[in-house]
């Protein structure tokens, strides 16, 4: 019996036309939502004038439906048993699942001021930036609507910069009408243990952002894993959002709508400093902000963001070192709300439920030449927002799954 089931599973998880896996892979049958919480800065003047701790108050959730678009340019390659595709991006605001509207205002770090002062470190150029910041009446902080902050706005300071720079700024700009990829993944036809594992991303097996093994594109995209998942496995996956591969480890057995699943979580070790986890040495890219690579829980992805000083962390700096969160007041990290998990059905390797949580932060540093940054006495990794991207198998799909997969086994 088991061999028959294995044979059926192996057949059905192959990524080719006609399989259960393929149908759900091309266009996810699960509704995926991305909730945002924005960190509203309560004391902008005190920070700018006195280098006070930044007092933040999270506001949210503001919810968008995402990942509702089918994969595009799906192309099978029979020669190397891969399938390539683009994952289109789209986000639709869901007012009924949100605390307010996209027109709600927030006081946040001025993204352009923080980024430009980091990118252009030449002192003379910084004096020019200072003039343009002042002329545009920009400051260290700004008031922006949710829509502007997420999806983009024309920045008045950057509009004056005499160099050819993008004048539109937004944390996820550009997003709608763009696509992630090209991904090329193994379809599993010749070897089911490689199904969904990424062969190349944007035509390469490496990212060119990191040194050594940190630069590798490992595992799948976390939507599914090769079948017959064991609790002892370390599940590798690549996330373009954080510009790196990461891994999850088994935490517990969970019953999801009558389907036994394995809950895999991102362990704190994945965010540890090289002192505690030597494997992470290559994610430490500079010595000053990282305090000689002893800080942990924040990932400098500036190389992946055209030099903009973007730092990724878990929400509320969960699993981060005290020095990171010390200059920020109003954070309350807790594992239940702020960690990332994947609920994987072990026979098929399908992720039936997940919660991907991450926080977007921006580094801002003192600058002698830029008046609005002149009074800062320290570097700040400023939280801008955190997000919770979730998906759960629908009741109908769960019934079908139970009857066709788990029911047959039990």
């Amino acid at each position: 019996g088991d061999l028959l089931i294995q044979k059926t599973i192996k057949k059905q998880v192959v990524l080719e036309e006609g399989t259960i896996a393929f149908k759900n892979w091309v266009k996810t049958g699960t509704e995926v939502y991305r909730q945002f919480w924005i960190f509203d800065v309560q004391n902008p003047q005190e920070v700018m004038m006195n280098s006070s701790n930044i007092q933040v108050k999270q506001r949210g959730p503001y919810t968008y439906r995402v990942r509702f678009l089918a994969k595009e340019n799906v192309t099978q390659d029979a020669e190397d048993n891969t399938v390539s595709f683009l994952q289109p991006n789209g986000a639709i605001f869901e007012p009924s699942l949100s605390v307010g509207t996209e027109a709600d205002n927030f006081t946040v770090l001025n993204l352009a001021v923080a980024a430009a002062s980091h990118i252009y470190q030449n002192q003379f150029v910084q004096m020019i930036l200072n003039s343009l910041i002042n002329k545009s009446k920009s400051s260290m902080f700004q008031v922006r609507t949710l829509r502007e902050l997420l999806w983009g706005y024309r920045d008045p300071f950057l509009s004056l910069v005499p160099y050819p720079v993008t004048t539109t700024v937004g944390l996820f700009y550009p997003y709608n009408n763009t696509a992630d990829g090209v991904y090329k993944v193994f379809n599993g036809k010749d070897n089911i243990s490689k199904v969904a594992i990424i062969d190349t991303y944007k035509g390469k097996r490496n990212l060119s952002y990191w040194e050594s093994h940190c630069d590798m594109i490992n595992g799948t995209d976390a939507a599914s894993f090769p079948p017959f998942v064991e609790k002892s496995q370390v599940l590798q996956f690549f996330s373009s959002d954080i510009c790196r591969s990461i891994y999850a480890v088994f935490e517990s057995d969970v019953n999801l709508k009558g389907i036994p699943v394995y809950r895999f979580v991102l362990p704190s070790k994945a965010f540890a400093s090289p002192v505690e986890n030597p494997d992470n040495y290559c994610f430490c890219t500079e010595k000053i902000i990282s305090k000689n690579c002893t800080s942990y829980g924040v990932l400098d992805i500036s190389k992946c963001k055209e030099g903009r000083p973007v730092y990724i962390s878990l929400p509320h700096f969960l699993y981060a070192s005290p020095d990171v969160s010390e200059p920020i007041d109003g954070l309350n990290p807790n594992e239940e709300e702020h960690r990332t998990y994947l609920d994987i059905e072990p026979i098929t390797g399908f992720t039936l439920q997940f919660a991907k949580r991450l926080q977007v932060n921006l580094l801002v540093k003192p600058s002698e030449k830029i008046q609005v940054l002149k009074n800062l006495k320290r570097n700040y990794i400023v939280p801008i927002l955190w997000l919770n991207e979730t998906g759960t198998i629908g009741d109908e799909k769960a019934n079908m799954f139970r009857s066709q997969v788990t029911g047959k086994i039990n």
């Epitope: 002192q123 003379f124 004096m127 020019i128 003039s131 002042n134 030449k369 008046q371």
Partner: antibody, heavy 116, light 107 residues
Framework: QVQLQQSGTELVKPGASVKLSCKAS????????MHWVKQRPGQGLEWIGE????????NYNQKFKGKATLTVDKSSSTAYMQLSSLTSEDSAVYYC?????????WGQGTTLTVSS | DIVLTQSQKFMSTSVGDRVSVTCKAS??????VAWYQQKPGQSPKALIY???YRYSGVPDRFTGSGSGTDFTLTISNVQSEDLAEYFC?????????FGAGTKLELK
């Protein structure tokens, strides 16, 4: 538009001090750093130093430390440069120039002659 | 201090000609170079920043190029009003320094 009105020609004796002025208009004086540059007759340009009019923070060329002192008066949007212990080597035209897109606006210059 | 050498003190040209003024830095300054034009009895006028970007209002016959240590200001189709002294300036590091100047004269 940016305008910089510098004080007139100065004729001073060696060993004396002089204070040159540069009155700014057409822009927010405290928003742009002010630079001072020296040009001796028939010679090149030498950077003296810079001042942030918002808080009077200064940076000097090491060569002019002790020679030049930069100050501002925010109320009159005027930058000043005091030159002390004057010698014939200090005879030159002195320019003020605020940083906008660079040193893209210069005053008309003040001619200083040091002679006994 | 970074020394900027403008090897030619004088350059002779005719109206309509193309002329190149050079500037060599004693160490790498990236593209942190500006060019200025100065006519007798006048203040310097900024022409070029970041080695190759023209300030607004500067005629497009003025072109800047170079990076690292070697920089050139090219004036194509020289006009009589271009007869002046040209200075390069580096702002890669302090103190800011200028070249000694190159005077453009009529043949």
């Amino acid at each position: 538009q940016v305008q910089l009105q510098q004080s007139g020609t100065e004729l001073v004796k060696p060993g004396a001090s002089v204070k040159l002025s540069c009155k700014a208009s057409g822009y927010t004086f405290t928003s742009y750093w002010m630079h001072w540059v020296k040009q001796r007759p028939g010679q090149g340009l030498e950077w003296i130093g810079e001042i942030d009019p918002s808080d009077s923070h200064t940076n000097y060329n090491q060569k002019f430390k002790g020679k030049a002192t930069l100050t501002v008066d925010k109320s009159s949007s005027t930058a000043y440069m005091q030159l002390s212990s004057l010698t014939s080597e200090d005879s030159a035209v002195y320019y003020c120039a605020p940083i906008y897109y660079g040193l893209d606006n210069w005053g008309q210059g003040t001619t200083l002659t040091v002679s006994s | 201090d970074i020394v900027l050498t403008q090897s030619q003190k004088f350059m002779s040209t005719s109206v309509g000609d193309r002329v190149s003024v050079t500037c060599k830095a004693s160490q790498n300054v990236g593209t942190n170079v500006a060019w200025y034009q100065q006519k007798p009895g006048q203040s310097p006028k900024a022409l070029i920043y970041s080695a190759s970007y023209r300030y607004s209002g500067v005629p497009d016959r003025f072109t800047g190029s170079g990076s690292g240590t070697d920089f050139t200001l090219t004036i194509s189709n020289v006009q009589s009003e271009d007869l002046a002294e040209y200075f390069c300036q580096q702002y890669n590091s302090y103190p800011l320094t200028f070249g000694a100047g190159t005077k453009l004269e009529l043949k």
